[in-house]
């Protein structure tokens, strides 16, 4: 589905204004910040999305708490820029003419630098780790029970082709979910895993960005899991370019 | 159809207690933020605070802070408002408001009437 | 965040075009909507993010403004209009303007 035509809102993204005024009345959502008008009937990319959160009503940080267990926020908040398809562009810069190289889901991959710094390309990251630890349970999940629950869940909430899902480990109390897509392999249409993982961090976190829909209720057989911690490692498909000194 | 349904009106003496539900029906109950609306006679509307049903937060604006606590009950989908220690001031009409992605209250109920009076 | 609506009355005619005002004591960037309250009625929300029409709201209202300065708009002015009608902010917490009366001359 796309924008719900009965109240006018975007099932995929709160963080967007919609009003009835797209060709014949149809209901049109733009995302905030960037005034981008979404596909409300897929995910938004992770740079709009950031773009939104940076213009949000104060009350989104305000009234949203991060649930009890959830990691403190420290995945770089920036203002980005997005290119017309709602990418990220290779070089970020902030307001003192700072300039960095990003990849594709955002995150810094060189030295920070000034303007004259070159980014040749949007360097894609095809290979996401996400380290979960679990809260105590009376035992540990079923390990393929916990394989099917978690794939279902990028399959339906987040509509990743279950082919991205390499793998699920686990070994009690941490669960690692391997999402792996290069270049080749995303076909049009297909969710990028790195948006997938930025749904499911901000889900994690109980700052749901689903229209209407609660948190994450997450049960493997009935039973409860509940994430108390989350470690998101992100591979490129070219290493970064980082000095040694950033090193020692 | 979005519906949010409220108790009906009540006359309470000073110094007692009230309290309000608001049934929701028609959408995703823990989605969405619910919020407190005081209207006294003659006077401005008034914000009076906020609870997501999903993690069960609230937030009060500060004049009610003491005077107001707001519940949940999601296996019913209601969000409840005491009122503590009443006085002649808090007659009022009392609407629950649903909050929309962006806050804003997209949705409301017919009102509850609380007369306080000795 | 204080809101400052004006004017507090108003009196016009089926047809002419009516201008309400709020201020915000402070950049609220384009977090405001508008309500049109009947009496014994619950608000109706008519327009937010400043300029947007909620749905199934007639085209002859509309909205402008952002940082401080708002306006609402009656294009022309139709009997069942009448109501008082209120401004939010929704930027930090919630204000509400104190309403503008409108009636019909």
């Known amino acids: 589905h796309t924008a719900a035509q009965d109240n006018c809102t975007c099932p995929t993204n709160k963080m967007t204004v919609c009003s009835p005024d797209g060709p014949g009345g149809r209901c049109q959502c733009r995302a905030l910040g960037s005034g981008m008008a979404v596909d409300c009937s897929t995910l938004t990319s992770k740079c709009l999305l950031l773009k939104a959160r940076m213009s949000a009503p104060k009350n989104a940080r305000t009234l949203v708490r991060p649930s009890e267990h959830a990691l403190v926020d420290n995945d770089g908040l920036y203002d980005p820029d997005c290119d017309p398809e709602g990418r990220f562009k290779a070089r970020q810069c902030n307001q003192t003419s700072v300039c960095w190289c990003v990849n594709s889901v955002g995150v810094r991959r060189t030295d920070k630098g000034d303007l004259s710094l070159r980014c040749d390309e949007l360097v894609r990251t095809h290979h996401i780790l996400i380290d979960l630890r679990h809260r105590p349970t009376a035992g540990a999940f079923n390990h393929s029970d916990l394989d099917a629950e978690l794939r279902r869940l990028f399959r339906e909430r987040y509509r990743l082709h279950p082919k991205f899902v390499a793998a699920v480990h686990y070994e009690q109390p941490t669960i690692q979910i391997e999402l792996r897509q290069n270049t080749s392999q995303k076909a049009a249409g297909d969710v990028d895993i790195g948006d997938a993982a930025y749904y499911f961090e901000r889900d994690i976190k109980g700052e749901s960005l689903f229209q209407g829909r609660g948190g994450l209720d997450l049960r493997v057989r009935g039973e409860p899991l509940q994430v108390e911690r989350t470690l998101i490692y992100y591979l490129d498909e070219i290493p970064p370019k980082f000095s040694m000194k950033r090193l020692t | 159809q979005v519906q949010l349904v409220q108790s009906g009106a009540e006359v309470k003496k000073p110094g007692a207690s009230v309290k309000v539900s608001c049934k929701a029906s028609?959408?995703?109950?823990?989605?969405?933020?619910m919020n407190w609306v005081k209207q006294a006679p003659g006077q401005c509307l008034e914000w009076i605070g906020i609870?997501?049903?999903?993690?069960?937060?609230?937030t009060y604006n500060q004049k009610f802070q003491g005077k107001v606590t707001i519940t949940v009950d999601k296996s019913t989908s209601t969000v409840y408002m005491e009122l503590s220690s009443l006085r002649s001031e808090d007659t009022a009409v009392y609407y629950c408001?649903?909050?929309?992605?962006?806050?804003?209250?997209?949705?409301w109920g017919q009102g509850t009437t609380v007369t306080v009076s000795s | 965040i204080q809101m400052t609506q004006s004017p507090s009355s108003l009196s016009a005619s089926v047809g002419d075009r009516v201008t309400i005002t709020c201020q915000a004591s402070?950049?609220?960037?384009?977090?405001l909507a508008w309500y049109q309250k009947k009496p014994g009625k619950a608000p109706k929300l008519l327009i937010h993010?400043?300029?947007n029409l909620q749905t199934g709201v007639p085209s002859r209202f509309s909205g402008s403004g952002s940082g401080t300065d708002f306006t609402f708009t009656i294009s022309s002015l139709q009997p069942e209009d009448i109501a008082t009608y209120y401004c939010?902010?929704?930027?930090?917490?919630?204000?509400f303007g104190c309403g503008t009366k409108l009636e019909i001359k």
């Open positions: 408001a649903r909050g929309a992605g962006l806050y804003y209250f997209d949705y």
């Open positions: 028609g959408s995703s109950f823990t989605g969405y933020t």
């Open positions: 609870i997501n049903p999903y993690q069960g937060d609230t």
């Open positions: 402070q950049d609220i960037n384009k977090y």
């Open positions: 993010y400043t300029s």
């Open positions: 939010l902010q929704y930027d930090d917490l919630f204000t």
